[in-house]
Interface confidence: medium
Amino acid sequence: AGVFELQIHSFGPGPGPGAPRSPCSARGPCRLFFRVCLKPGLSEEAAESPCALGAALSARGPVYTEQPEAPAPDLPLPNGLLQVPFRDAWPGTFSLIIETWREELGDQIGGPAWSLLARVTRRRRLAAGGPWARDIQRAGAWELRFSYRARCELPAVGTACTRLCRPRSAPSRCGPGLRPCAPLEDECEAPPVCRAGCSLEHGFCEQPGECRCLEGWTGPLCMVPVSTSSCLGLRGPSSTTTGCLVPGPGPCDGNPCANGGSCSETPGSFECTCPRGFYGLRCEVSGVTCADGPCFNGGLCVGGADPDSAYICHCPPGFQGSNCEKRVDRCSLQPCRNGGLCLDLGHALRCRCRAGFAGPRCEHDLDDCAGRACANGGTCVEGGGAHRCSCALGFGGRNCRERADPCAARPCAHGGRCYAHFSGLVCACAPGYMGARCEFPVHPDGVSALPAAPPGLRPGDPQRYL
């Protein structure tokens, strides 16, 4: 396990002529945010393929307004690193995708608009634990400067974060319920300090202040033997090996949740469901009243006037948990109406709308016939999220407001004269010509050069184009 870290140093117009002055142009103020996506291997993957190694989103940068006369600056950037945790081995070879997004803040129909400003995709080789790698990339007329690295999280070490190291304080022999494993590194640098009193023999920690029990032991300090352990039978002659692994040490082993909280495993970690009156990562915060503001994300706190009475958080739509601390998987609710594409950016939800729709959730049907009059007797026809006006004869244009002059294109051939008619146009042919558009010459002997049965025209028909 480890973390990929990306630091954006600058983003701005690239050198040379034709470079944009600003991402905002005349649109009003805007701000930037970045998205990083990691894909394994060096294969050229489709842009839509998942970010299998992980993805992260930056906060939004400061608001930027273009100064018309000022030189084009580097743009104000969001603070902090972008961090992408990875659970498994670091692959060494990977595809790095960095997207720069623009959020336009000017007043407009549908509210702030988000658009992808630049996207760089690079295949890279990188060993975990190495120094920061620096890079400059161009994306269209933009230039992005950034650094990145991969680092392991203890107890994992090595270029792929696959070797485990033993804290200096750890025992050098296998404890109960442990099976032999590949030798561990001799020492970790900066080992975490476990909870005071945590058994050196039967407990371990990956984060300061915790005490997680080896298989076969329990209790807050891992001092209490479990009467039956499925792992004890694993011990054998080779169990004196200096390196030991907990056989799949579950994150919930020894129940890290305090105060009666129940533990459930999540990928690479755990989650505590706390009883009322307690919260925190391990339900370690207690004696909470409504005055302490225990309800997150706009939850409404009820009861809990004193530490002895329980409070209840009434969560707003979109949040759940005893303290409204858990966000509902928002895209699973299909919040983007009318076929819009949902993007959960973490700090916000975005919808990419189909043509004809707008608004934060694509709820605004721009081409709805309702209230959209087609002028001059035209009728509105809806279909597939779009509308069009079917205009009465003699009228045209998007809303049938334009008077159509059927004679404007000079449709009558051979000097025929065109007359606009309520149902189209009429050609008055010059001597020697006939047909709806005066296109046929009349032979001197009076016999028409028409085919025997011209489609849609019989001798004697009025010469009118419908």
Epitope: L105, N338, R361
Partner: antibody, heavy 121, light 107 residues
Framework: EVQLVESGGGLVKPGGSLKLSCAAS????????IHWVRQAPEKGLEWVAY????????YYADTVKGRFTISRDNAKNTLFLQMTSLRSEDTAMYYC??????????????WGQGTSVTVSS | DIQMTQTTSSLSASLGDRVTISCRAS??????LNWYQQKPDGTVKLLIY???RLHSGVPSRFSGSGSGTDYSLTISNLDQEDIATYFC?????????FGGGTKLDIK
């Protein structure tokens, strides 16, 4: 406790103007979109207007478009509805209602008690 | 605009009854259907959002179901305090529209 308190209603002549206010408390006002909804006497509920948390997205019902203006002052936790060119059919109880946190559902999860507007000569 | 129709404008039932109120949309609203209760004093409360999700603080005797264009609100064990008018509202496409309401009283 979430509270929304409307004010500013009253009797006004046709063609006249009125400005309604909605004072919010008990939640982070700047995190939520807010709706105005009205109810004519002995009738159902009719959505009137909506403004997003930051004020960037504004929507109106066709019946009030061009006559009503919704706005908000996040520093003062207050929502406004400026009504002009009032007609007799605008006579109703006007409610402000809080939208949901992420505008996923477009619910109105907490409502004020309403303020009455009567348009009559 | 999407029209919301509550065919039953008033309904009488006995205490303890199971009551179902229906609502139909003029086109598919993809489950973005909310139910509100308006008490005789004019107080309005959200009961159910997104077709079937119970709003916080609402008794569990209220439930919602439906999809596409047809939706319903069920009160499983009618209580005296449930005397009110119930409105459905679609949150799928602007403008947001309400049903005409169903007034519920006790037999």
């Amino acid at each position: 406790e979430v509270q929304l308190v409307e004010s500013g209603g009253g009797l006004v002549k046709p063609g006249g103007s009125l400005k309604l206010s909605c004072a919010a408390s008990g939640f982070t006002f700047s995190d939520y979109g807010i709706h105005w909804v009205r109810q004519a006497p002995e009738k159902g509920l009719e959505w009137v207007a909506y403004i997003s948390s930051g004020g960037y997205t504004i929507y109106y019902a066709d019946t009030v478009k061009g006559r009503f203006t919704i706005s908000r002052d996040n520093a003062k936790n207050t929502l406004f509805l400026q009504m002009t060119s009032l007609r007799s059919e605008d006579t109703a109880m006007y409610y402000c209602a809080r939208g949901d946190y992420d505008d996923i559902f477009y619910t109105m999860d907490y409502w004020g008690q309403g303020t009455s507007v009567t348009v009559s000569s | 605009d999407i029209q919301m129709t509550q065919t039953t404008s008033s309904l009488s039932a006995s205490l303890g009854d199971r009551v179902t109120i229906s609502c139909r949309a003029s086109r598919d609203i993809t489950k973005f259907l909310n139910w509100y209760q308006q008490k005789p004093d004019g107080t309005v409360k959200l009961l159910i959002y997104y077709t079937s999700r119970l709003h916080s603080g609402v008794p569990s005797r209220f439930s919602g179901s439906g999809s596409g264009t047809d939706y319903s609100l069920t009160i499983s064990n009618l209580d005296q305090e449930d005397i009110a008018t119930y409105f459905c509202q679609q949150g799928n496409t602007l403008p947001w529209t309400f049903g005409g309401g169903t007034k519920l009283d006790i037999k």
